[in-house]
Interface confidence: low
């Protein structure tokens, strides 16, 4: 038994969740949704689950409903990654996985879905209403993120209704090319969904078939500075007291992004779609929890009293985040 919350509600319903009439009524919206997804407006779903057997253990599962190839997945808590959220794990389909406490196991479930287990005992566990976010960077859709959390009143072992609506931030470039007809269809879909708002939101346990282990391998990025993905975010407040969460600050991406796929040059240029922020050519994967990210070189210095992390003969580097000067 488990408590779970899922985002978004825009998921194919499980058989038996609704009566025959209700199911038939939703056929058209799902067809339209499929068209929307394949036409360049992908969705991200997030499922947060708390095991009844281990109350401090959370499982976050995220999936990408889009046709593009996923280049990076970032899981964060406390709000969107880049807007005060703390990164828990970063998964790259080729270059492997890196994670941060209290993440215990991050893994690919399929080519388009991931799971992450958060461990904890007592104080080290996230509170039940913590917001968890998954951001999928893909080509050509761009960056999409959704967030979800367990309802504060969730009792272990009881199924919680899914979060009613997704929190999505789309790279504007990701919706270029959508025809007017499909846009109308999507609007109509939303209209239909709003009419069905009084119903329990349909749920989908994303397929666990054909799991793909990440092809982790040693990787040496090119020395050239590359463009980083940058998406404007809206801050999501969590009702957790700050003391119960590891504080986070805005930050840059991992050094994995120092070498982008060859098709990067063909990414559509939309407003705030791809910023020209330089990424370190080669260097450490700096924990984003601290909020520092060296734009070049091995390690950012810290502004804490008397604390210098691996002094670099190349001198000071530009940094992102509140503890450094950009």
């Amino acid at each position: 038994m488990r408590t779970e919350a899922q985002v978004p509600a825009l998921q194919p319903p499980e058989p038996g969740l609704e009566g025959a009439m209700g199911h038939r009524t939703l056929v058209l919206p799902w067809v339209l949704l499929t068209l929307c997804v394949t036409a360049g407006t992908p969705e991200v779903w997030v499922q947060v689950r708390m095991e009844a057997t281990e109350l401090s253990s959370f499982t976050i599962r995220c999936g990408f409903l889009g046709s593009g190839s996923i280049s990076l997945v970032t899981v964060s808590w406390g709000g969107p990654n880049g807007a005060g959220g703390t990164t828990l794990a970063v998964l790259h389909p080729e270059r492997g996985i890196r994670q941060w406490a209290p993440a215990r196991q991050a893994r690919w479930e399929t080519q388009s879905s991931i799971s992450l287990i958060l461990e904890g005992s007592g104080a080290s566990s996230p509170c039940a209403n913590t917001t968890f976010c998954c951001k999928f960077a893909s080509f050509p859709e761009g960056s999409w993120e959704a967030c979800g959390s367990l309802p504060p009143s969730s009792d272990p072992g009881l199924s919680a209704p899914p979060t009613p609506a997704p929190i999505l931030r789309a790279d504007l470039a990701g919706i270029l090319g959508v025809s007017g007809v499909l846009l109308f269809g999507c609007v109509y879909l939303l209209h239909l969904l709003r009419r069905h708002k009084h119903r329990p939101a349909p749920r989908l346990q994303p397929s666990r078939t054909s799991p793909q282990a990440p092809r982790a391998r040693a990787w040496a990025p090119s020395q050239a500075s590359q463009a980083a993905l940058h998406v404007p975010y809206a801050t999501i407040n969590t009702s957790c007291r700050p003391a119960t969460l590891d504080t986070a600050h805005p930050h840059g991406g991992p050094s994995w992004w120092a070498s982008l796929p060859t098709h990067a040059a063909h990414r559509p240029q939309g407003p705030a779609a791809w910023a020209s922020t330089p990424i370190p050519a080669r260097g450490s994967f700096v924990s984003v929890e601290n909020g520092l990210y060296a734009q070049a070189g091995e390690r950012p210095p810290h502004t804490g009293p008397g604390l210098t992390l691996f002094p670099d003969p190349r001198g000071p580097r530009a940094m992102e985040g509140p503890l450094g000067v950009r």
Partner: antibody, heavy 119, light 107 residues
Framework: QVQLQESGPGLVKPSETLSLTCTVS?????????WNWIRQPPGKGLEWIGY???????NYNPSLKSRVTISVDTSKNQFSLKLSSVTAADTAVYYC????????????WGQGTTVTVSS | DIQMTQSPSSLSASVGDRVTITCRAS??????LHWYQQKPGKAPKLLIK???DSISGVPSRFSGSGSGTDFTLTISSLQPEDFATYYC?????????FGGGTKLEIK
């Protein structure tokens, strides 16, 4: 530069509680990072005991979890280890160490303090 | 728990030799593998992080490679000060676990 210094009794009787303190200088313990305890029995390898994060969150090695408590005293800029019901197998050099940026590795360590469990 | 198996447990070599130490994880730890050097009576010192990332201040003769479950620490040309015990450490999943160590001795 941050420095860590372990302190505590060098001799503990079996079944008693081992208590060690790590005093941190050069950095505010409540500001960031994870503060760890690691031990090394004589002539043997290293074993991670657990950590306390800057915000008070803890994580312990399951093999020791029932006996371990790690706490922090921000007013003294210290964090402490308590290991109950000790036996001779707990005789070791105990190190405190800091993890910068989480999984980047234990960069700074204390010099270690030897604890012998004997009656 | 993830078990880390280091080999060899001891190694005799001469100054100028090229030395390779291996570490195997019982399950995939991706790149979350770090190498340490420990000298008698001293605390361990971080040599390599994330399997292959060098550390500022550590001589360039130390290098690391590998990903997943198999990792290697290489010392390209042994120096007198390199004779010590070397440990690998996985920080992918708690409990963090060290390898059993490789004692590098002078031949």
């Amino acid at each position: 530069q941050v420095q860590l210094q372990e302190s505590g009794p060098g001799l503990v009787k079996p079944s008693e509680t081992l208590s060690l303190t790590c005093t941190v200088s050069g950095y505010s313990i409540s500001s960031d990072y994870a503060w760890n305890w690691i031990r090394q029995p004589p002539g043997k390898g290293l074993e991670w005991i657990g950590y306390i994060r800057y915000n008070g969150n803890t994580n312990y090695n399951p093999s020791l979890k029932s006996r371990v408590t790690i706490s922090v005293d921000t007013s003294k800029n210290q964090f402490s280890l308590k290991l109950s019901s000790v036996t001779a197998a707990d005789t070791a050099v105990y190190y405190c160490a800091i993890i910068y940026y989480d999984y980047d590795g234990f960069v700074y360590w204390g010099q270690g303090t030897t604890v012998t469990v004997s009656s | 728990d993830i078990q880390m198996t280091q080999s060899p447990s001891s190694l005799s070599a001469s100054v100028g030799d090229r030395v390779t130490i291996t570490c195997r994880a019982s399950q995939n730890v991706y790149e979350n593998l770090h190498w340490y050097q420990q000298k008698p009576g001293k605390a361990p010192k971080l040599l390599i992080k994330f399997a292959s990332d060098s550390i500022s201040g550590v001589p360039s003769r130390f290098s690391g490679s590998g990903s997943g479950t198999d990792f290697t620490l290489t010392i390209s040309s042994l120096q007198p000060e390199d004779f010590a015990t070397y440990y690998c450490l996985q920080l992918y999943s708690t409990p963090y676990t060290f390898g059993g160590g490789t004692k590098l001795e002078i031949k």
